[in-house]
Interface confidence: low
């Protein structure tokens, strides 16, 4: 189970993980105390290559080709959490692990 | 964490799980002894609706809108295995649990 890593200079057309820094201040999300920004990454690219497909199911659906099936798309296949300090709706400060905030790997599914 | 269920008569445009029976015999996959067919299901539909997004990350990337980011796509968010009886490459009969063969839920990621 693997995925490709790319950067803004890459010429790779296949499904790939790209760096992306999310800046909460830039969004105006001022209820987030820390981190103010973090490396989230994102997935982009084409999915016509079998070796990047995460599940055998993806290949089977491609073969069956049902109505409305758009084919596999490039999406996170492994994600990890980050620890965040933020205000909740009652203006209390919360420290917690927020799941699925960082893309570690991309694949076709 | 939830997803929509549809069928071939649905007018639903959002990301949805549709029924699909995979027929191994029809594919010519004669190394699979059993099952000869099974209900695999598949995902299809649009992903512009926040409530079907699986991860907060999806919403953040949409806000950041990086180059090449195609927006979330409708993909399996929960899958389950099936038990299969099949010939391996050495012509031995194997009985095993094959992961991620059935789509239980679809979402936008």
């Amino acid at each position: 189970d693997f995925g490709l890593d790319c950067d803004e200079h890459s010429t790779e057309s296949r499904c790939c993980r790209y760096p992306l820094t999310v800046d909460f201040e830039a969004f105006g999300w001022d209820w987030i105390i820390a981190p103010k920004r973090y490396k989230a990454n994102y997935c982009s690219g084409e999915c016509e290559f079998v070796f990047l497909q995460k599940y055998p199911h993806t290949h089977l659906v491609h073969q069956a080709n049902p109505r409305g099936s758009a084919g596999p798309c490039c999406t996170p296949t492994k994600m990890s959490p980050i620890n965040m300090l933020y205000f909740n709706g009652k203006e209390q400060i919360i420290y917690g692990k927020i799941p699925a905030m960082v893309v570690d790997r991309c694949g076709c599914s | 964490d939830f997803g929509l269920d549809c069928d071939e008569h649905s007018t639903e445009s959002r990301c949805c799980r549709y029924p699909l029976t995979v027929d191994f015999e029809a594919f010519g996959w004669d190394w699979i002894i059993a099952p000869k067919r099974y209900k695999a299901n598949y995902c299809s539909g649009e992903c512009e609706f926040v409530f079907l997004q699986k991860y907060p990350h999806t919403h953040l990337v949409h806000q950041a809108n990086p180059r090449g980011s195609a927006g979330p796509c409708c993909t399996p968010t929960k899958m389950s295995p099936i038990n299969m009886l099949y010939f391996n490459g050495k012509e031995q009969i194997i009985y095993g649990k094959i992961p991620a063969m059935v789509v239980d839920r679809c979402g936008c990621s």
Partner: antibody, heavy 122, light 110 residues
């Protein structure tokens, strides 16, 4: 104290305009989705529209073009601009706050103002 | 757009009785349903969201259930202070972040 207070209602002639204000206190305006809902005398609730955390607005189909929602974070106030008013727009107008400050529950309003009455009549 | 239909229009029951209010969506809305209570001269109060989650401060005698197109609000033992009009409400993604309310059910105390 956490509260929403609407103002700006009153009597207006058909074809006229009115701007309603919703002053919020006790929380940060930009952290929450805000909505406007109206209720004609003796009738049920009718959704007008929302402004979400990022400032995007969404409207009921009947309100598009005539009604505009905006906000001023520095004044902690949300506005509803109503144009080309008709007799059937006569109602109590409520300002409401979405219950989730991460923007995923745009539609569940857990904090409401007392409402302001708008009467459209000649 | 989704249309929400509530039944009955009016209900008259005695204190202590079990109350069942119904809300039907014109198409599947999964769990995207909220219930509100409104008393005369007051704004609505959120009771239930996501079909079955009790809002903060709401007594446990209120219970929401259902998914897809059929939803129910149950008051296990009616109290005098529960006399009000109850509205269901959904989020309608198809009309791009639209919200639809049911027409309401008025609960009276005998």
């Amino acid at each position: 104290e956490v509260q929403l207070v609407e103002s700006g209602g009153g009597l207006v002639q058909p074809g006229g305009s009115l701007r309603l204000s919703c002053a919020v206190s006790g929380f940060t305006l930009s952290h929450y989705v805000k909505g406007w809902v109206r209720q004609a005398p003796g009738k049920g609730l009718e959704w007008i529209g929302i402004i979400n955390i990022s400032g995007s607005t969404y409207y009921a189909s009947w309100a598009k073009g005539r009604f505009t929602i905006s906000r001023d974070n520095s004044k902690n106030t949300v506005y509803l601009q109503m144009n080309s008013l008709r007799a059937e727009d006569t109602a109590v107008y409520f300002c409401a706050r979405g219950h989730d400050n991460f923007g995923y529950s745009y539609h569940d309003f857990n904090l409401w103002g007392q409402g302001t009455l708008v009467t459209v009549s000649s | 757009a989704v249309v929400m239909t509530q039944s009955p229009a009016t209900l008259s029951l005695s204190p202590g009785e079990r109350v069942t209010l119904s809300c039907q969506a014109s198409q599947s809305i999964h769990h995207e349903l909220s219930w509100y209570q409104q008393k005369p001269g007051q704004p609505p109060k959120l009771l239930i969201y996501l079909a079955s989650t009790l809002a903060s401060g709401v007594p446990s005698r209120f219970k929401g259930s259902g998914s897809g197109t059929d939803f129910t609000l149950t008051i296990s033992s009616l109290q005098p202070e529960d006399a009000a009009t109850y509205y269901c409400q959904t989020y309608d993604g198809i009309s791009h972040y639209g919200v639809a309310f049911g027409q309401g059910t008025k609960v009276e105390i005998k």
